[in-house]
């Protein structure tokens, strides 16, 4: 079992993740682990020498880079916020700020926009991943209501008047809650006819 550096006639290395082919010497050499970079290239008699990334820089993968990447903050102007800091082994982790969704994607999200409002009587369909797409508004299910224009308001169950020792004065709709009244209160005049029936 050869250890790097070793000769390779077919230009491939046994461990593609941790080794790379060096064409000048036609050998396989070790890559540097995450959080490090190549400080001295390999030769036929000496393997790659790696050094730790300096503060504020990183390399995420096994690599044969001669520099580390500079850490960059998430861009708040683009609607992004940080969920995890940059370390020597990973870049800053970003996501869309609350109430926003990813509108431009290039390997990662680069630009977030405000979620659109869902009108009364609807709510945003719950997604697997927050911030991945704009709201898709769906009607409140039976027995529920939502009375605002909002990107995040959820449909709530109608109040059950009997649970509060009250009686229903007006039924709930998708956009409004049930109206309850004291059982001893007289009905308003416009509703008294319906009671007589």
């Amino acid at each position: 079992q050869a250890v790097p550096p070793y000769a390779s006639e077919n230009q491939t290395c046994r461990d593609q993740e941790k080794e790379y082919y060096e064409p000048q010497h036609r050998i396989c050499c070790s890559r540097c682990p995450p959080g490090t970079y190549v400080s001295a290239k390999c030769s036929r008699i000496r393997d790659t020498v790696c050094a730790t990334c300096a503060e504020n820089s990183y390399n995420e993968h096994w690599n044969y880079l001669t520099i580390c990447q500079l850490c960059r903050p998430c861009d708040p102007v683009m609607g992004l916020e940080e969920i995890a800091p940059c370390t020597s082994k990973r870049k800053t982790q970003c996501r869309c700020q609350p109430g926003m969704f990813c509108a431009a994607w290039a390997l990662e999200c680069t630009h977030c926009e405000l979620l659109s409002d869902c009108p009364p009587g609807t709510e945003a369909e719950l997604k697997d991943e927050v911030g991945k797409g704009n709201n898709h508004c769906v009607p409140c299910k039976a027995g529920h209501f939502q009375n605002t224009s909002s990107p995040s308001a959820r449909c709530q169950p109608h109040t059950r008047c009997e649970n509060q020792g009250l009686v229903e004065a007006a039924p709930g709709t998708a956009q409004s809650d049930t109206t309850c009244k004291n059982p001893l209160e007289p009905l308003p005049p416009e509703m008294s006819g319906t009671m007589l029936m």
Partner: antibody, heavy 116, light 107 residues
Framework: QVQLVQSGAEVKKPGSSVKVSCKAS????????LHWVRYAPGQGLEWMGW????????QYNEKFKGRVTITADKSTSTAYMELSSLRSEDTAVYYC?????????WGRGTTVTVSS | DIQMTQSPSSLSASVGDRVTITCKAS??????VAWYQRKPGDAPKSLIS???YRYSGVPSRFSGSGSGTDFTLTISSLQPEDFATYFC?????????FGQGTKVEIK
């Protein structure tokens, strides 16, 4: 060498605000995050939030959101932490710290006492 | 938020003793854990980052280990200047969180 010099101790009344400063030197102020952490004997160390002086953007711990404001003045390489609506539980030592895989550099701390 | 549960909360030991402090994260934090020493009236002192990397100037008797959720700080031979409170911290995700601290006292 990296130095973080903080303002002096403060005694405040409940309901008031306090503003603590942290002057940085020995490095490029705009390229490193500056955090604020507090220590109270009963509660241990608590992370409050950070500022990235390069774009003067701050992020906060939800626990302090609405009460804490972190700002920075690039011209003087100084960061500030203002805590409002003070209560007795805010009596603590407040530290600024520069981050990189933890907090390698800390200020000496500013003692804030909240008492009526 | 990620909880960092540190144990023990205090311990009594003698000069020369081997001391072990553990920290358990409520979820996987990789190796993104630091350890600090704090003495009354002083700023916390950074001892370890990346779970096991010892900062320059920190004596070799201090060592850190662990990954994922379980982490350990070991002082191989306790010295008089080591009597202090020790904290672990995760910097894997915001909000950063600390353990409650372990006070190392003289027996």
């Amino acid at each position: 060498q990296v130095q973080l010099v903080q303002s002096g101790a403060e005694v405040k009344k409940p309901g008031s605000s306090v503003k603590v400063s942290c002057k940085a030197s020995g490095y490029t102020f705009t390229t490193y995050y500056l955090h604020w952490v507090r220590y109270a004997p009963g509660q241990g160390l608590e992370w409050m939030g950070w500022i990235y002086p390069g774009n003067v953007h701050a992020q906060y711990n939800e626990k302090f959101k609405g009460r804490v404001t972190i700002t920075a003045d690039k011209s003087t390489s100084t960061a500030y932490m203002e805590l409002s609506s003070l209560r007795s539980e805010d009596t603590a030592v407040y530290y600024c710290a520069r981050s990189w895989e933890g907090f390698p550099y800390w200020g000496r701390g500013t003692t804030v006492t909240v008492s009526s | 938020d990620i909880q960092m549960t540190q144990s023990p909360s205090s311990l009594s030991a003698s000069v020369g003793d081997r001391v072990t402090i553990t920290c358990k994260a409520s979820q996987n934090v990789g190796i993104n854990v630091a350890w600090y020493q704090r003495k009354p009236g002083d700023a916390p002192k950074s001892l370890i980052s990346s779970a096991s990397y010892r900062y320059s100037g920190v004596p070799s008797r201090f060592s850190g280990s662990g990954s994922g959720t379980d982490f350990t700080l070991t002082i191989s031979s306790l010295q008089p200047e080591d009597f202090a409170t020790y904290f672990c911290q995760q910097y894997d995700t915001y909000p950063f969180t600390f353990g409650q601290g372990t006070k190392v006292e003289i027996k």
